[in-house]
């Protein structure tokens, strides 16, 4: 009598995640009586995938009607494939008994799962850095298979070269992850700049996935300070202006000091944006020179984005101006914010 053969015609099958996989198996004879079982893997640790004889396998169905005696087709279909289903599947014939005795195994069919990478997630530095410093951005994407993948970085459309990329794990796995770090040199013009991480994979049919990060989240552009005095007004008041320019982000506190004493504190809010994304702010202070005997040292103190305060001082010469008798008025805090848009 001809020896029983268990035939698995395909050495390998590749399926997209979410699709169904058909694993083919035929036997050359139904003798002796006994079940066909499907396993993933070989050896003692193999995993039972389908047993016509018994059990509940909700994702696995027989391709042909197993209740037809002349049916020698024991192919199965596994629905809703995930990367975790990858592996080598064996169709195995048993002889009925207690226990069932394994007679013959097919050669095995390797199931590989084509899984799309997750949307790339780009994260920037935890703290802001100033222009002319280099910051690192990381890009991560997970769950893809096969392992081959391409990742590119762009800043404002230009590809970055200072990049380090790793795909894990190094060995065989059901799915893979990629992590890439790009080092970006910041300039004062980068508030509106963007970095893009672009991932290309066979499952994406030439339509790469992109993750983005705005450099506005990573950059701090410190302000320029300039304190100027306007011409003396007829009422002996001097208008002193503090111009704070080209800063980012908007979080800024300005304090006026007269001879070292706090005169007024203001917080920047709802400022219009410059074309390059930075902000300008002008604050002014009216100083009644007739209320002072000596020169007045005015200081514009700016604390930007939690950084140490930056000062700019200016002396208002009082000696040149006549004193009003009995006047003890301090510098008036009636100044309003002027906003200069550049």
């Amino acid at each position: 009598e001809e020896e029983l053969q268990v035939i698995q015609p395909e050495k390998s099958v590749s399926v997209a995640a979410g699709d169904s996989a058909t694993l083919n198996c035929t036997v050359s004879s139904l003798i002796p009586v006994g079940p066909i079982q499907w396993f993933r893997g070989a050896g003692p640790g193999r995993e039972l995938i389908y047993n016509l004889k018994e059990g509940h396998f909700p994702r696995v169905t027989a391709v042909s009607d197993p209740t037809k005696r002349n049916n020698m087709d024991f192919s199965i279909r596994i629905s809703n494939i995930t990367p975790a289903d990858a592996g080598t599947y064996y169709c195995v014939k048993f002889r009925k008994g207690s226990p069932d005795v394994e007679l013959k195994s097919g050669a095995g069919t390797e199931l590989s799962v084509r899984a799309k990478p997750s949307a790339p997630v780009v994260s920037g530095p935890a703290v802001r850095a100033t222009a002319e410093h280099t910051v690192s951005f990381t890009c991560e994407s997970h769950g893809f298979s096969p392992r081959d993948i391409t990742l590119k970085w762009f800043k404002n459309g230009n590809e970055l070269s200072d990049v380090q990329t790793n795909v894990d794990p190094a060995g065989k796995s059901v799915s893979y992850s990629i992590r890439s770090t790009a080092r970006v040199l910041l300039t004062r013009r980068d508030v509106h700049s963007q970095v893009i991480c672009e991932v290309a994979h066979v499952t994406l049919q030439g339509d790469p996935l992109r993750g983005t990060a705005n450099l506005s989240e990573a950059i701090r552009v410190p302000p320029f300070l300039e304190v100027t005095q306007q011409s003396m007004r007829a009422d002996n008041q001097v208008n002193v202006t503090c111009q704070v320019t080209k800063f980012y982000p908007q979080r800024l506190q300005l304090t006026w000091l007269e001879n070292g004493n706090v005169s007024r504190t203001e917080m920047a809010s709802a400022l219009p944006e410059n074309k390059d994304g930075t902000y300008n702010w002008t604050s002014w202070l009216l100083v009644n020179v007739s209320a002072h005997r000596d020169d007045v040292k005015l200081t514009c103190q700016v604390e930007h984005d939690g950084q140490p305060a930056v000062n700019k001082s200016f002396s208002v010469k009082v000696s040149a101006h006549p004193k009003e008798q009995g006047s003890n008025t301090a510098a008036e805090n009636t100044g309003t914010n002027e906003r200069n848009i550049y």
Epitope: V33, G34, E54, S98
Partner: antibody
């Protein structure tokens, strides 16, 4: 429709012979293991004989050497040749189809009565 | 030969009851155990194979369990048409053998 119909039962004297037939319809009999099961009046079920798809035959101890199971593929029929009949062989004889890959009984005929009596 | 022992031999129950019949094999039969239902004057009907798999058309109120030597048939809610005699059978090796039967009667 899958069906099994037995015939050939009747009254026979001890030591006599009888040939039971089972006509199969709705499936190819040669593709299945086929069985004969009997039941004496008021008693339980007793497996008697089987024939495998390869023509291999099996019998219960009490009928070995006296009964012969066979099939005729052209007629899609199963037979049980019963010789040297005894009173203890009196029973309703059922033709039964074995299940696909494990031989679990799935289809039963309606039975035919065999009475061995003088 | 493998001996099959059913218990109880007879059982009285009411409509709506849940009943369990047990079957014990004299040696390990894996799960090659079948259950049959027979009504007077009729051929047996196949209910369950491989201990727990229902034949097509068999209502889900019938369930089987067990492996090795000890098996059970459970009918979850008895209906008038379920009063009959039930047999277990091992079919792991020849000669196939049946239990002596359990007669289920209306109380």
């Amino acid at each position: 429709e899958v069906q099994l119909v037995e015939s050939g039962g009747g009254l026979v004297q001890p030591g006599g012979s009888l040939r039971l037939s089972c006509a199969a319809s709705g499936f190819t009999l040669s593709s299945y293991d086929m069985h004969w099961v009997r039941q004496a009046t008021g008693k339980g079920l007793e497996w008697v004989s089987a024939i495998g798809t390869a023509g291999d035959t099996y019998y219960t101890g009490s009928v070995k050497g006296r009964f012969t199971i066979s099939r005729e593929n052209a007629k899609n029929s199963l037979y049980l040749q019963m010789n040297s009949l005894r009173a203890a062989d009196t029973a309703v004889y059922y033709c039964v189809r074995g299940g696909v890959w494990d031989d679990a009984f799935d289809i039963w005929g309606q039975g035919t009565m065999v009475t061995v009596s003088s | 030969d493998i001996q099959m022992t059913q218990s109880p031999s007879s059982l009285s129950a009411s409509v709506g009851d849940r009943v369990t019949i047990t079957c014990r094999a004299s040696q390990d039969i894996n799960n090659y155990l079948a259950w049959f239902q027979q009504k007077p004057g009729k051929a047996p009907k196949s209910l369950i194979y491989t201990a727990s798999s229902l034949h097509s058309g068999v209502p889900s109120k019938f369930s089987g369990s067990g492996s090795g030597t000890d098996f059970t048939l459970t009918i979850s809610s008895l209906q008038p048409e379920d009063f009959a005699t039930y047999y277990c059978q091992q079919y792991v090796s020849y000669p196939y053998t049946f239990g002596q039967g359990t007669k289920l009667e209306i109380k």
